[in-house]
Interface confidence: medium
């Protein structure tokens, strides 16, 4: 296999393959519960687990929630796909001042160049408008009246917005926070950044730093302050906390400045398909006792299904893994990750990701 000669329905009578007339070759038939990653799979590795809608299969073969672009200042750049998250970006007229994984934690309106400045580079979803001094012989036919002002002393290479107090701020420099839609009309009336030294003559502070949160007394820890419902990840990026809004989820730990909210299945349910800091699918089942882990199994038996080829070893619940390895830990909980194809990251791949707390009760696999 593949075969180039047509066979109706079967390929040499092999039940694990079928003939695809469209591509005129024999293709591997994915076992039940697994879905093909291409039109004509050739081997078991061309089959993948199916995640719930609005989840994608991450690099560790875990079902992970796609980010949502539901905030007023965000729009969808790329949709949620089977193997990649939805990507959000700031809506037109705004740029991202504090990035988040696959999204933006804080969007600002593009600055309008002040008097004496003209647009060098228009603002994008990622970058603010870049201004440059107007040449003495600038044509009156300017794109914007604001860009036709007489040159003034002092130049700024980029009009960098700052989250300043509303009394001195224009809409062009105000962040739009979740749930608040600033009317474009208001933004168009307040077009020019204030001609003050704080906004024109010198660079502002990092928009990601909260001006309302001074350093703690006796501490130099002026950490980056993320938007509500975002946390600062290990790479220093503001990352959206997961949501526990699904009926079968409850909040285990809240969204903190440096850690995501974590969700777990509500009482009486356990996690059958893990998601980072959450659970993609909760099912009303118990799991192995606290002392047990699941034996590794052959690739052919991952997500053991109707037609899983009878290869490899049988996965059982045993006191210790067959290979003597201790169960892998994925913080914050000790976890029995038994997701399909999770062997890339953990030595105990079978089929329903669950975790055990120190009490032996099932808790969510935080991924």
């Amino acid at each position: 296999f593949p075969q180039d000669r047509p066979f109706e329905d079967t390929c040499h009578g092999n039940p694990s393959h079928y003939y695809d007339k469209a591509v005129r070759r024999c293709c591997y038939r994915c076992p039940m519960g697994l879905f093909p990653t291409q039109q004509c799979p050739q081997r078991p590795t061309d089959c993948r687990k199916q995640c719930e809608p609005d989840y994608y299969l991450d690099e560790a073969d875990r079902c992970t929630a796609c980010v949502t672009c539901s905030r007023d200042d965000l729009v969808e750049k790329t949709p949620c796909a089977w193997n990649s998250s939805r990507v959000c970006e700031c809506r037109p007229g705004m740029f991202c001042s504090t990035s988040a994984v696959n999204s933006c934690a804080r969007c600002f309106f593009h600055s309008v160049c002040p008097a004496g400045m003209i647009v060098k580079f228009p603002g994008t979803a990622q970058k603010n408008t870049v201004c440059e001094p107007a040449s003495p012989g600038v044509s009156p036919a300017c794109a914007s009246p604001e860009n036709c002002k007489e040159p003034s002393s002092g130049t700024i290479p980029q009009a960098k917005p700052t989250p300043v107090s509303p009394a001195t701020s224009s809409a062009s420099t105000m962040p739009v926070r979740g749930g608040t839609r600033l009317a474009q009309e208001a933004a168009s009336k307040l077009t020019r950044a204030p001609d003050s030294p704080s906004s024109v003559g010198r660079p502002s502070s990092d928009p990601g730093l909260s001006p309302t949160q001074p350093c703690p007394e006796g501490s130099g820890d002026c950490r980056k302050q993320c938007e509500p419902d975002y946390y600062l990840d290990e790479a220093g990026r503001c990352t959206a906390c997961v949501s526990c809004s699904r009926d079968d989820l409850v909040e285990k730990t809240p969204c903190a400045w440096n850690s995501s909210r974590t969700c777990e299945c509500r009482p009486g349910m356990i996690c059958a398909t893990s998601a980072t800091n959450s659970c993609a699918r909760c099912v009303p089942y118990p799991i192995c006792a606290a002392e047990t882990v699941t034996k590794p199994q052959d690739m052919a038996e991952k997500d053991t299904t109707f037609e899983a080829p009878p290869l490899g070893t049988q996965p059982d619940c045993n006191p210790t893994p067959e290979n003597g390895e201790a169960p892998a830990s994925t913080s914050p909980t000790q976890s029995l990750l038994v997701d399909s194809q999770a062997s890339k990251t953990l030595p105990i791949p079978t089929s329903a990701p669950v975790a055990l707390s120190s009490t032996g009760k099932p808790v969510l696999d935080a991924g």
Epitope: R29, C30, M32, G33, P53, D303, T305, F306, L311, S340
Partner: antibody, heavy 117, light 108 residues
Framework: EVQLLESGGGLVQPGGSLRLSCAAS????????MSWVRQAPGKGLEWVSG???????YYADSVKGRFTISRDNSKNTLYLQMNSLRAEDTAVYYC???????????WGQGTLVTVSS | QSVLTQPPSASGTPGQRVTISCSGS????????VYWYQQLPGTAPKLLIY???QRPSGVPDRFSGSKSGTSASLAISGLRSEDEADYYC?????????FGGGTKLTVL
């Protein structure tokens, strides 16, 4: 709450056809594999057919070539088209959800198919 | 004739422990998980044991499953009258799914 409701059973003559339906609710239908399992009167359970990815279908040898399983994810419905029916196909046909290695975790109440002249 | 072999009947008195066996081959039980289903009279089957020895929520811990090689067994301890039912073992085989012939359990 997960619910599976079969319909379409009835009396049919040998050689005839019948189409069974299974209406699913309470879960994301398109994300699960589904199956038909039958039980002849006073007999044991027999797996008939399964469906995963839309064009990936699976059949017991006893029905291969005569039965066709299909699904309509937009209607959350599973189907079993039964042609060339035989007396030995007489059974209660159950629709069952299959989830990874949990097996058939939810079953419908079944619909009776009687093949008799 | 079923691919998996079960005794057609078993019986016990209330409080007793009863074991139902299921014998297969390397292509089904030997290389895959075993499941047990309970079918009470006049009702649809219900998942009783999955992944050889795991119980779904709601299934009493009186029910336990085990597997060794190409055989599996279901044990019911502290037998009750409501346990009177048909019990089926099941396993995968290459590209299909097989059931045992079923065991009728009678509570005397």
């Amino acid at each position: 709450e997960v619910q599976l409701l079969e319909s379409g059973g009835g009396l049919v003559q040998p050689g005839g056809s019948l189409r069974l339906s299974c209406a699913a609710s309470g879960f994301t239908f398109s994300s699960y594999s589904m199956s038909w399992v039958r039980q002849a009167p006073g007999k044991g359970l027999e797996w008939v057919s399964g469906i995963g990815y839309p064009y990936y279908t699976y059949y017991a040898d006893s029905v291969k070539g005569r039965f066709t399983i299909s699904r309509d994810n937009s209607k959350n419905t599973l189907y079993l088209q039964m042609n060339s029916l035989r007396a030995e196909d007489t059974a209660v046909y159950y629709c069952a959800r299959y989830y990874y290695d949990y097996g058939f975790d939810y079953w419908g109440q079944g619909t009776l198919v009687t093949v008799s002249s | 004739q079923s691919v998996l072999t079960q005794p057609p009947s078993a019986s016990g008195t209330p409080g007793q422990r009863v074991t139902i066996s299921c014998s297969g081959s390397s292509s089904n039980i030997g290389s895959n998980y075993v499941y047990w289903y309970q079918q009470l009279p006049g009702t649809a089957p219900k998942l009783l044991i999955y992944r050889n020895n795991q119980r779904p929520s709601g299934v009493p811990d009186r029910f336990s499953g085990s597997k060794s090689g190409t055989s599996a067994s279901l044990a019911i301890s502290g037998l009750r009258s409501e346990d009177e039912a048909d019990y089926y073992c099941a396993a995968y085989r290459s590209y299909d799914y097989v059931f045992g012939g079923g065991t009728k359990l009678t509570v005397l």
